[in-house]
Amino acid sequence: QRFAQAQQQLPLESLGWDVAELQLNHTGPQQDPRLYWQGGPALGRSFLHGPELDKGQLRIHRDGIYMVHIQVTLAICSSTTASRHHPTTLAVGICSPASRSISLLRLSFHQGCTIASQRLTPLARGDTLCTNLTGTLLPSRNTDETFFGVQWVRP
Amino acid sequence: QRFAQAQQQLPLESLGWDVAELQLNHTGPQQDPRLYWQGGPALGRSFLHGPELDKGQLRIHRDGIYMVHIQVTLAICSSTTASRHHPTTLAVGICSPASRSISLLRLSFHQGCTIASQRLTPLARGDTLCTNLTGTLLPSRNTDETFFGVQWVRP
Amino acid sequence: QRFAQAQQQLPLESLGWDVAELQLNHTGPQQDPRLYWQGGPALGRSFLHGPELDKGQLRIHRDGIYMVHIQVTLAICSSTTASRHHPTTLAVGICSPASRSISLLRLSFHQGCTIASQRLTPLARGDTLCTNLTGTLLPSRNTDETFFGVQWVRP
């Protein structure tokens, strides 16, 4: 009872429980390797609690250390397809502000059709995360095959 | 101030720290693609704090957003074996109640012998998670090669 | 009773928010399969808040359940290279104290050049985690390709 009462003074976001899980909306136009994401309960099981989307890219609203995770599966893919179209690479990084631009996580598909990874990284309010998929294969838009999320872990 | 005081009355589980890490017990009978899990300190480093096992499947006891993670390694496997037996696919989903049935996470092995991934997803009390392995290869029961877990992240 | 009250006065580490993210420093001498890690803001985006490094290996300072994650990418690697040099295997385990020695997480590269995984595991103060890479290929030292971290989740 008192636990619940205590929470009443502060919304969850003020406890630092920022979290988001996104599903793929679309890929960019040619020459734009970025993946464009969407999230919200109307779309299924994706959500944003704290972070926001800015033109399909995830913007951080609270300073802290975050767990960033991603899975991307290539559409209509076999190991032969994947090796033939090598290098197909996914990179997650801070793309703005430009002064903080850096690659956080990078994976190549080689002979596989799915990459999945996660890492802890400090992020600051206003950081925008971009996910760049280079290569000539399309990512699957199935929500159980391609997703991207962050979870605030500590200040 | 009141948040910290409130914590004094309540056990850990009431803080929403539900967490479980499971090891493979056995595969299902033919035509049942589900993996059957087990957990508890007597078994090694697996445990359940909050969630429960129901006939080898993981049942959630607290509403919230969870980080779900899994690694499955195929037994006596080489890249040749894996490609020869393609498609071997692992899917994690809510299998009951039927009204909430959905695939949360899906991966194919292609030419690899291990898949590993993780994602954030909302789960509700009573949701049962099933892990379906389709194909003709056996999963390794080594506890450092095959495991499945959830961690409550926020309400 | 006093723990909750004490939290009001104490720094973050006392809340159990131990966390570390490390980057590869170097490989061991011949016959030593261990990877040697480094961390700290001067090195980039790696950090240690609670855990410490002991001769390049990660030592835990607080009992609890931890999320352990790792990604290792092989240097100058193609799927041909990876399959040719199979088995190349990464294992994360408790290497000291000897009485608690155990493998926690194990992955082979097969035809891929990157492995990435994560798991929940109980760790105790004083546990040292080692990451052993067996095989004849070098791990990439790029900070977005090879990293290792832990996050305290609950007591």
Epitope: - | - | A75, I76, T136, L138
Partner: antibody, heavy 120, light 111 residues
Framework: EVQLVQSGAEVKKPGSSVKVSCKAS????????MHWVRQAPGQGLEWMGA????????SYNQNFKGRVTLTADKSTSTAYMELSSLRSEDTAVYYC?????????????WGQGTLVTVSS | DIVMTQSPDSLAVSLGERATINCRAS??????????MHWYQQKPGQPPKLLIY???NLESGVPDRFSGSGSGTDFTLTISSLQAEDVAVYYC?????????FGQGTKLEIK
Amino acid sequence: EVQLVQSGAEVKKPGSSVKVSCKASGDTFPRYNMHWVRQAPGQGLEWMGAIFPGTGETSYNQNFKGRVTLTADKSTSTAYMELSSLRSEDTAVYYCARNSYYDYAWFTYWGQGTLVTVSS
Amino acid sequence: DIVMTQSPDSLAVSLGERATINCRASKSVSSSGYSFMHWYQQKPGQPPKLLIYLADNLESGVPDRFSGSGSGTDFTLTISSLQAEDVAVYYCQHSREFPPTFGQGTKLEIK
């Protein structure tokens, strides 16, 4: 410690072929690329190619335009380099070489060298 | 192919003095956080001997007066105090990609 022992010196006519052997001690033969490097008299070092004995896969320097063939016999831990259509400028010392630990193309272990003289 | 260019072609240094040999690659030989540049010593009638690998790692058994440095395209082999037995030809070599290539060699003599 790995030792690489090569076959003896050869004198060959232009247009003929030569086959040089390299026997490796130790049990790591299948796990490391075996490289071949040549050195013409008073000249520098030139990489010719490599074979991965475990699978028989090869990589060649395109400068040799298909004249080099690398093979390996796992049962005897022996690698072979055959050079065809010999000409006078192929007169050189031919070395086999490999790495000691990491299987990248830098060379800890070298054979003693085999002098091949091409002369009419 | 990556072209490796050593300078100077020959070098005469007094015993006990420092000797420096440079090697420039026609493109970067760095990848994955390493510089794939190596140095060898060759004496007459002998195969080359590995001194330095991955730009700055001293091979086991090599005296610590030998050291390597550099990254990207420019690398240096340094002998801090020349000894009589160091008279030889020195080669740089990259292994960033196939084919690996060697520098033309630098002949080191005693002044």
